[in-house]
Interface confidence: medium
């Protein structure tokens, strides 16, 4: 499901004639089962995130909310295609859904791969502005700026994924009974120039879809951690426990993103390098066989994000509880307005409203009064 297609064996006669490649041994029901689990958790989790964000009143939403909503939409659009890929994998790579769905579902996967990565980056940068430079960049974080940034990231994601829409097709590659959904470069490339397309798309997707965003995220969280550490140094010793928890949340975010996407991009990059460096056959074959599992792990990220970004916030949990309770008579004691108030916006993790240290719309005006007491991930 990557942009690239085949660049094994076409290129480098030595590789082709000496390495004993064989048909990929199917994982059976394992990968399809994981895809379906990600689909179920992803639709539920991201659906809850969207519900929580959009049920809050407009004035109580913060700049981060637009990224959180976008991230949830991206992940949601991503995971709804997974039943198709689960079916395809389970049928031992036989695509029964037609060319249009092959193109569209492949395209949606990549639009939303980019979009979700960009959303995480936007959210990280928003956290950076909120925590490290809250005064100087308060205007940058207005809802209008957030909307513009979101529009840009979606357009960029849509454009970056376009090669998938163009080159994906279905084909009975050997006039056998199976139909594959694959990348076909024959309209633009000869065998010799296929390599350039493969490397170009592979390198660009890894650079733009992983290396650059991850570098930005890492940089943002480095400064965030530095700022938090600075704040806690000024506070009393009881703050140490809070500091550890908050820093661990940030570490979890970055590490989870890395753990989910690193294997995919690393294996892909090593494989591309193999055509230049001529890895031993066993290693080349290992990369080929491990790649579907790396893809699977990267897809898991789309159902983890709601848990990582929302479930650390007690208000999100309250909102979920109130939603579950709404349909049950035993919860009638909880007033609707109260539950609505409590779940206002899970990105504003304050126990108080805009107080003396708050600017217009609840923006923080003094660095030293950042309310970490909620230990919420997306604190404003």
């Amino acid at each position: 499901m990557e942009e690239g297609g085949d660049f094994d064996n076409y290129y480098g006669a030595d590789n082709q004639s000496e390495c004993e490649y064989t048909d990929w041994k199917s994982s059976g029901a394992l990968i399809p089962a994981i895809y379906m689990l990600v689909f179920l958790l992803g639709t539920t989790g991201n659906g809850l995130v969207l519900w929580t964000v959009f049920r809050s009143s407009r004035e109580k939403r913060r700049s981060a909310d637009i990224f959180i909503a976008s991230l949830a939409v991206a992940d949601l659009t991503f995971v709804v295609t997974l039943p198709l890929w689960a079916t395809y994998t389970y049928r031992d790579y036989d695509w029964p859904f037609g060319t249009f769905s092959c193109k569209l579902s492949s395209y949606l996967i990549f639009v939303n791969m980019y979009a979700s990565v960009f959303c995480l980056t936007g959210l990280s940068f928003d956290r950076y502005l909120a925590i490290v430079r809250p005064v100087a960049n308060a205007r940058l974080r207005l809802r209008v700026s957030g909307a513009v940034a979101t529009a840009v990231l979606w357009v960029l994601a849509a454009l970056l994924a376009m090669p998938v829409m163009v080159f994906r097709t279905t084909g009975d590659l050997e006039n056998t009974t199976k139909v594959q959904c694959y990348m076909d470069y024959s309209m633009v490339a000869t065998v010799s120039s296929d390599w350039a397309w493969e490397v170009g798309l592979g390198v660009s997707s890894t650079t733009v879809g992983f290396v650059v965003p991850f570098t930005i995220m890492l940089t943002c969280y480095f400064f965030i951690a530095q700022t938090i550490a600075g704040h806690f140094r000024k506070e009393r010793i009881e703050g140490l426990r809070k500091r550890r928890r908050l820093l661990s949340i940030i570490v979890v975010l970055v590490v989870t993103f890395a753990l989910c996407w690193m294997p995919y991009h690393l294996v892909k990059t090593l494989y591309m390098l193999g055509s230049l460096l001529h890895w031993p056959c066993d290693f080349d074959l290992f990369l080929m066989n491990v790649f579907p599992y790396c893809t699977c792990i990267s897809y898991v990220n789309s159902c983890l994000n709601p848990f990582l970004y929302a479930f650390f916030d007690p208000r999100f949990r309250q909102a979920c509880t109130s939603m579950l309770c709404c349909g049950q008579s035993r919860c009638a004691g909880t007033s609707h307005s109260s539950s609505g108030e409590k779940s206002a916006s899970y990105s504003s993790g304050h126990s108080q409203g805009p107080g003396p240290n708050m600017g217009k719309g609840g923006e923080q005006m003094h660095e030293k009064s950042i309310p970490y007491s909620q230990e919420t991930l997306v604190v404003d």
Partner: antibody, heavy 129, light 107 residues
């Protein structure tokens, strides 16, 4: 050294049967698709059949479908061609050959056939009364 | 079935000459074509696969090109050991089909 050695050819009457064997050495036989190709003396080459590594997929040219059966024994590093209901037009030199495929890294299940890279010396089958 | 038509069926050339053999497919076969060399009493030997990829150990004077329905094998600077019969093979779909062959003879 990679080697394929065919055996089992000979003279047979029309309607008769023959079983060709191909012994493989010098490579991991179980990792490759294998083919049979024939050549009528003084004429061109004709692909006959091929078989997947585990024997789960087999393909034949229309002229031999229902009469010829390709099979393999990976434990013995051997490929076979069972020929039944033989006709005069089946007279040919039969070559056993190793198939090569390119496999898509990204699109699992997609493979590209690259022809036959190693051939045996051939075994002659003559169908005559 | 895809029909493969080779031309010429034979040609007489001298050592050092440039030789071009053409293979036409009855329908589009992308880049799925190979070239084989066969000497009398010997098994065929693969020269080129996937239109232009050179088999390991094959001299660089052999090259392939083309796409879709028209393909070419070029031998730049024919050597004495190159006098043989050359076949194209489409490996796009089943059944695999060979061209009828081109015999390259000494002038």
């Amino acid at each position: 050294e990679v080697q394929l050695v065919e055996s089992g050819g000979g003279l047979v009457q029309p309607g008769g049967s023959l079983r060709l064997s191909c012994a493989a050495s010098g490579f991991t036989f179980s990792s490759f698709w294998m083919s049979w190709v024939r050549q009528v003396p003084g004429k061109g080459l004709e692909w006959v059949a091929n078989i997947k590594q585990d024997g789960s997929e087999k393909y034949y040219v229309d002229s031999v479908k229902g009469r010829f059966t390709i099979s393999r024994d990976n434990a013995k590093n051997s490929l076979y061609l069972q020929m039944n209901s033989l006709r005069a037009e089946d007279t040919a030199v039969y070559y056993c050959a190793r198939d090569r495929f390119g496999y898509s890294f990204y699109d699992k299940g997609v493979r590209y056939y690259y022809g036959m890279d190693v051939w045996g010396q051939g075994t002659t089958v003559t169908v005559s009364s | 079935d895809i029909q493969m038509t080779q031309s010429p069926s034979s040609l007489s050339v001298s050592v050092g000459d440039r030789v071009t053999i053409t293979c036409r497919a009855s329908q589009g076969i992308r880049n799925d074509l190979g070239w084989y060399q066969q000497k009398p009493g010997k098994a065929p030997k693969r020269l080129i696969y996937a239109t232009s990829s050179l088999q390991s150990g094959v001299p660089s004077r052999f090259s392939g090109s083309g796409s879709g329905t028209e393909f070419t094998l070029t031998i730049s600077g024919l050597q004495p050991e190159d006098f043989a019969t050359y076949y194209c093979l489409q490996h796009n779909s089943y059944p695999r089909t060979f061209g009828q062959g081109t015999k390259v003879e000494i002038k």
